[in-house]
């Protein structure tokens, strides 16, 4: 049955309340310089109106502060409001390293996120770090690696696992959770030109995940003991006709193509799913494509298999797709899917459909594929186009959180995190904030504090504290000495 | 490594028609744009135009949307330019050029040149 | 169209020198230029891109600066392979164009 009633319970006490943000673009100098300058000022108030220094006295100037970045301000008065636990962002490759290499590190820009992450951490707000966040319009890499081809240079990866090596290594004492790379298997929108660009680029991005993922666990966890995974693109797909074979098999051939072509070869084998290689190559025999999924060495299978933590997951919607052979030798045309747009479901501005049971079904569909194993909704939410009462928004939130949690008490789900999308709207972008695009807050900010305040949907008479485990008190102390530490 | 090879140089009558061709090796053919670029002595460097091979999409610059026209097969990894209806001001060398993915005007390899010479 | 303007047309220096070559674009292409080096004879070779990034190989007495309109390639300790023909490019938007060259020529 595709809807079932709603239920009664809670998330566990653990359990990540989140908001996500894309890339945060760093300040490069703190907005407050008035606390840095040692001179004495008079103003001439009624005459040039100008100020002019009075030689001879030097003031006591005090440090700089995180909180003289002024964006960072905004940023905790909007989390604050959200009462969320983990607050995801990402990291703007281009401006910690703009050579692509390690020969000039951009140290404004790593002090400006080492300071979102510890102010955050100051409200009890823990931070989910993504390392790389290319969208459609930015591919977000530093000019020297998109000037050598990108994602198609395998060189890329090499200065992937540099940058995340820096990036553990200043940040990491903070971080906890770590996200390498969000949604690369939506990069085939921008290698799109042949089949063979696509599959090329996201082995890379493979290898570049799964090299960071090796330097972390060699390096890094013994003394940081955080988890890294990548954020994969996670929407269900459902037949268009129920009643058509082709259907339900196209449905299947959507999340092979979508999501187990990245999730295979890191939670399971190590290489692309068989069903997809198999489906490509049957093409290529009949002459309908020129595409071939690349062929992993015994290395590379190594390299790849087992590098994640946790399995993190974008999901938005529920496509409905059908059956249609296409000839072409692209990634779109290799799948034989074409979409249908449901006019009696409830959509968004964007034409997101609502199908709140899209979402359990996935994670079902995850955990029956990769095992069971800890699952973080790393990005779900929808565009709304209110400014204040965004009811299509609560509505949203309220009925797939419904379905997560029936993912968690009824199958039994590992689900350890919900982090809504997102934090703040952009200029002239579908609105999905919290927020607009000019800090105003809207009533879903409520809705949402509701339930984390009562951890999702309990009886009437059930109790929605925690109690504060002597671990988590100690965990709190370390981070408060690793703040105050010079 | 990638390497553009074009073909010789030609002596040409005014009014005729010419095809320089410009065989791509190592690298996916279909998925960058082949730059054409004509230099005249004295005259610099000029952008005629560009193809991608695997969707036959052309762009061209003004001036040359009637004196040349792109091909390319991409079974043989060859880009075409073919210039018609030649006069004197078309003696120049011309070049092909492969682009960045990302950046196609950046141009990182180019053919040896081939000399086009326009005399009756 | 975007006009790329190098106004020296010949530059006259010795081994061991360091010279600037100049370019000016017609409108903003922020740092979408490359440079790049032709001797006589030969095709073009890349040498710096996005303003001033030096193309792998490149030796670093090359560089590059600048955005928006201004551009300037400096070669720092000349040396007598360096005599050849300097083009800007911008690759911003298309129609991508040249500047008209600046010869270097060692005394």
């Known amino acids: 049955k595709e809807s079932t009633p709603d239920v009664q319970g809670q998330f566990p006490c653990d359990f990540s309340w989140g908001v996500t943000e894309s890339v945060l673009k760093p300040e490069s100098v703190a907005s407050s310089p008035q606390f840095s300058d040692p001179h004495l000022y008079v103003w001439n108030a009624t005459g040039n109106r100008l100020l002019h220094r009075v030689e001879g006295v030097r003031l006591k100037t005090r440090p700089a502060q995180c909180t003289d970045f002024v964006n960072i301000k905004k940023q905790l008065e909007m989390l604050a409001r959200m009462k969320v636990t983990h607050y995801r962002f990402a990291l703007d490759w281009a401006s910690v390293l703009p050579t692509g290499n390690l020969s000039a590190v951009n140290r404004q820009a790593l002090r400006y996120y080492r300071c979102v992450v510890s102010e955050g951490l100051k409200l009890g707000i823990s931070a989910m770090v993504t390392l790389y966040y290319p969208t459609h319009a930015h591919l977000g890499l530093p000019e020297p690696l998109l000037h050598a081809d990108g994602w198609l240079n395998p060189s890329t990866a090499e200065a992937f696992q540099a940058y995340a090596g820096l990036c553990f290594q200043e940040l990491g004492d903070l971080v906890k959770l770590w996200i390498t790379i969000n949604e690369p298997n939506r990069l085939s929108d921008i290698y799109n030109r042949s089949g063979n660009d696509t599959y090329g680029a996201a082995h890379n991005l493979l290898v570049a995940h799964a090299l960071a993922w090796r330097l972390y666990d060699r390096q890094f966890r013994p003394s940081q003991r955080g988890a890294v995974s990548l954020s994969l693109h996670a929407d269900w797909a459902e037949p268009a006709n129920p009643y058509a074979d082709s259907h339900w098999r196209a449905a299947e051939r959507f999340l092979q193509f979508e999501i187990a072509w990245f999730a295979e070869p890191l939670f399971k084998t190590g290489d692309y799913p068989a069903a997809m290689r198999e489906y490509i190559a049957s093409k290529h025999r009949r002459g309908l494509s020129s595409s071939a999924l690349p062929r992993l060495t015994e290395a590379e299978r190594r390299l790849l298999k087992g590098t994640v933590d946790f399995c993190a997951l974008n999901h938005f919607t529920t496509r409905f797709v059908m059956h249609e052979q296409l000839a072409g030798s692209r990634y779109d045309s290799d799948r034989d899917i074409q979409f249908l747009q449901d006019i009696t479901r409830l959509s968004s501005p964007t034409r997101l459909a609502v199908i709140p049971w899209g979402v359990r079904k996935l994670l079902r569909w995850v955990r029956r594929n990769y095992g069971d194993m800890d699952i973080y909704i790393t990005a779900s939410g929808i565009d709304d186009q209110a400014l204040e009462d965004d009811r299509l928004r609560k509505y949203y939130l309220g009925k797939y959180l419904q379905e997560v949690l029936k993912a968690y008490l009824i199958d039994k789900v590992r689900i350890k995190g919900y982090y809504a999308f997102k934090l703040a709207e952009e200029k002239s972008k579908p609105r999905f904030g919290f927020f607009t695009s000019d800090f105003k807050a809207k009533s879903s900010i409520q809705f949402y504090n509701k339930v984390i305040s009562s951890r999702g949907f309990p009886f009437e008479n059930s109790s929605s504290r925690c109690s504060q485990t002597q671990e988590n008190t100690e965990c709190t102390v370390c981070l408060f000495l690793v703040q105050k530490k010079p | 490594q990638v390497q553009l090879q074009q073909s010789g140089d030609e002596l040409m009558k005014p009014g005729a028609s010419v095809k320089i061709s410009c065989k791509v090796t190592?690298?996916?053919?279909?998925?960058?744009?082949i730059e054409w670029v004509k230099q005249r002595p004295g005259h610099g460097l000029e952008w005629i135009g560009e193809i991608l091979p695997g969707s036959d999409s052309t762009k061209y610059v003004e001036k040359f949307k009637v004196k040349a026209t792109f091909t390319a097969d991409t079974s043989s990894n060859t880009a075409y330019m073919q210039l018609s209806s030649l006069t004197s001001e078309d003696s120049a060398v011309y070049y092909c050029?492969?682009?960045?993915?990302?950046?196609?005007?950046?141009?990182?390899?180019w053919g040896q040149g081939t000399l086009v010479t326009v005399s009756a | 169209d975007i006009v790329m303007t190098q106004s020296q047309k010949f530059m006259s220096t010795s081994v061991g020198d360091r010279v600037s070559v100049t370019c000016k674009a017609s409108?903003?292409?922020?740092?979408?230029v490359a440079w790049y080096q032709q001797k006589a004879g030969q095709s073009p070779k890349p040498l710096i891109y996005s303003a001033s990034y030096r193309f792998s190989g490149v030796p670093d007495r090359f560089t590059g600066s600048g955005s928006g309109t201004e551009f300037t390639l400096t070669i720092s300790n000349v040396q007598s392979e360096d005599l050849a023909e300097y083009f800007c490019?911008?690759?911003?938007?298309?129609?991508?164009?040249f500047g008209g060259g600046t010869k270097l020529e060692i005394k």
């Open positions: 050029a492969r682009g960045g993915y990302h950046y196609p005007g950046w141009l990182v390899y």
């Open positions: 490019q911008q690759y911003n938007i298309s129609p991508y164009t």
């Open positions: 190592g690298n996916t053919f279909s998925s960058y744009w």
């Open positions: 409108q903003n292409v922020d740092s979408y």
